[in-house]
């Protein structure tokens, strides 16, 4: 007698029992429960979603996916074993010895069985699809993530790479300007020391000319007075002995006049009999301003006043109004006299103007005016010129009728143009002129063809830069 | 430096044709007037004719207007002097001169000879059959 009964287990789980006369066979089912509704984020028979943004998790649950298929797939091949081992031996009893509802039951059994087994395939089949989907998906992420990671790797490494070449470089310049700045201080301090000893050495020399120039002119004064002195005891000498020689002569008393110890111009210094050329000191006309000049007491019977002087170059003569009105340079050597005293001094007295010039090639030249006269500031130190007669060229060189004085700042031509900017130095330019004695200083064999040089045209043309010129003064009456 | 070059002068028959040339050097001619000068044997130096580059203005002595052309090429630095229907009294020395053309008295178009700073070594030209 057999008999057929469906149960449920106390863990929740169906089973199946058959009772075939002593013996009774129980068939405990895997449920379906266990696998995931279709609501959970892996649907079943269900189209696969992206795979989750957090890769941990894809991997844990990966992990429970492939315990569950290995169960169900471990289950089945046990079940299979046992339906091969166990149930072909009972089938032939049961076919041998049941009777036709049996067999029934056996092959709804058996039917329900192969159901139960084909949903659990299906079942797998689709568990083992999302498995090799989401597999594939998460290796191709791997993938990717590694591709990125090697290529971030070899970025990071040729950044490393760079950035310890610059440290390097950088060390190494680092080094190099600190070595650099211990050099620079080094110089810098020494170059101070001596810059203070030049200083100090100039400041020192400076007082030594100084003191040196007072000696100079204190022992040319010195020396013209005894030269006076010694003329005048010889004529006192002279007259006593004629006195003593003539018995009839009445005994005088020589009434000598007091020295006189301020001149307006060297032709008073030399009257005075200091005749040695040299510095000495002028006083401006009814003034008790003085200033130092130059005094030619050589050339043409001596007396001259020196008021401009070129020789070398060592003075700068593109000066401003300021300069040229109080005078500039170094009576020594090249320098300026001033426009306001020469003009104070011949506008008292008529003056005559001589100017020597020198050219390279060993010539000497003069042109002299019988009558010069500067205007005041007023008339911009116009030049007044008459009766040219010398050696350097039978018309005059400096414009006629008289043109006033211009400056680099002070522009008073007759120019479109300013030529004390265009030619350098201060003169009485005209559009611009035939001459400037105060041009630009060119040594020899660079003194031709010159727009802006020491220029007289009617003795040496243009362009020809002279080598050296003065420009001298003395009373018309001396 | 500033240098003057003049060339094209030589022997030619009355009534004949000389061009000359100035090749200027050290000066650019937009900023300068160039002046042709002559002077005959024992005579003074005298002025034959001139061009302002910059305005394209241009200067004749009275002997010489309608024979003598005066022109400039900038991009050569070079002025010319084309002398056509040449006469004996044109036998000279030619000379080319530079002179900053801003250097001009008001009023006036052309220059004194002593404005011209800058001279060449001149050319001869002589007119003779």
């Known amino acids: 007698y057999s008999n057929f009964r469906k149960s449920v287990d106390s863990t929740g789980r169906r089973q199946y029992q058959v009772q075939n006369g002593p013996c009774s066979y129980t068939f405990l089912l895997p449920e379906t429960d266990s696998c995931r509704s279709s609501s959970s984020p892996y649907m079943s028979n269900a189209v696969q979603r992206d795979a989750p943004l957090d890769y941990d998790d894809s991997v844990q649950r990966l992990q429970v996916l492939e315990n569950i298929l290995e169960n169900n797939t471990q289950w089945l091949m046990k079940l299979e074993n046992y339906i091969q081992d166990n149930m072909k031996k009972e089938m032939v009893e049961i076919q041998q010895n049941v009777v036709q509802n049996q067999t029934a039951v056996m092959i709804e059994i058996g039917t329900s069985l192969l159901n139960q087994t084909a949903a659990q395939t299906r079942k797998l089949t689709d568990v083992e699809a999302q498995v090799l989907n989401q597999t594939t998906r998460l290796e191709l992420q791997l993938l990717q993530h590694s591709i990125s990671t090697n290529k971030l790797e070899k970025q990071i490494l040729d950044q490393t790479s760079e950035i310890n070449k610059l440290q390097n470089k950088n060390s190494f310049l680092e080094q190099k300007v600190l070595d650099m700045e211990g050099k620079h201080s080094e110089q810098l301090q020494s170059m101070k020391e001596q810059k203070d000893e030049l200083q100090v050495l100039v400041s020192k020399q400076s007082s030594v000319i100084d003191e040196l120039e007072k000696k100079l002119v204190t022992a040319t004064v010195n020396n013209s007075l005894l030269q006076k002195q010694q003329h005048d005891l010889m004529e006192t000498v002279n007259s006593l002995l004629t006195m003593m020689s003539s018995p009839n002569s009445k005994s005088s008393v020589a009434i000598r006049k007091e020295e006189q110890t301020t001149f307006r111009d060297c032709a008073e210094i030399f009257k005075s009999g200091l005749t040695t050329s040299g510095i000495y000191t002028l006083t401006f006309p009814n003034s008790t301003e003085e200033i130092k000049a130059y005094c030619d007491m050589d050339v043409g019977g001596g007396g001259w006043t020196v008021i401009q002087h070129r020789e070398d170059g060592s003075v700068d003569f593109q000066r401003t109004w300021k300069e040229y009105k109080e005078g500039f340079g170094s009576p020594l050597g090249e320098y300026w006299l001033g426009n306001e005293f020469v003009s104070q001094l011949t506008g008292q007295h008529r003056y005559v103007l001589k100017i020597q010039l020198k050219d390279w090639e060993g010539n000497e030249a003069h042109s002299l005016y019988d009558h010069f006269y500067l205007a005041g500031e007023e008339s911009n130190y116009r030049i007044h010129l008459t009766g040219l007669t010398g050696t350097a060229g039978k018309i005059s060189s400096i414009s006629q009728p008289g043109s006033d004085f211009s400056t680099k700042d002070s522009d008073n031509d007759k120019c479109i143009c300013k030529c004390s900017q265009m030619l350098s130095g201060g003169w009485w330019f005209d559009a611009c002129g035939p001459s400037n004695l105060n041009g630009q200083y060119y040594p020899q064999k660079q003194n031709t063809n010159k727009f802006n040089g020491i220029k007289w045209y009617y003795w040496k043309g243009s362009g020809y830069s002279l080598k050296a010129t003065t420009m001298m003064i003395r009373p018309a009456d001396f | 430096e500033v240098q003057l070059v003049e060339s094209g002068g030589g022997l030619v028959q009355p009534g004949g044709s000389l061009r000359l040339s100035c090749a200027a050097s050290g000066i650019t001619l937009d900023d300068y007037a160039i002046g042709w000068f002559r002077q005959a044997p024992g005579k003074e130096r005298e002025g034959v004719s001139a061009?302002?580059?910059?305005?394209?203005?241009?200067y004749y002595a009275d002997s010489v207007k309608g024979r003598f052309t005066i022109s400039s090429d900038n991009s050569k630095n070079t002025v010319y002097l084309q002398m056509n229907s040449l006469r004996p009294e044109d036998t000279a020395v030619y000379y080319c001169a530079a002179v900053p053309a801003g250097r001009l008295r008001y009023g006036e178009q052309w220059y004194p000879i002593y404005e011209y700073d800058a001279w060449g070594q001149g050319t001869l030209v002589t007119v003779s059959s």
């Open positions: 061009i302002r580059s910059s305005g394209g203005s241009t």
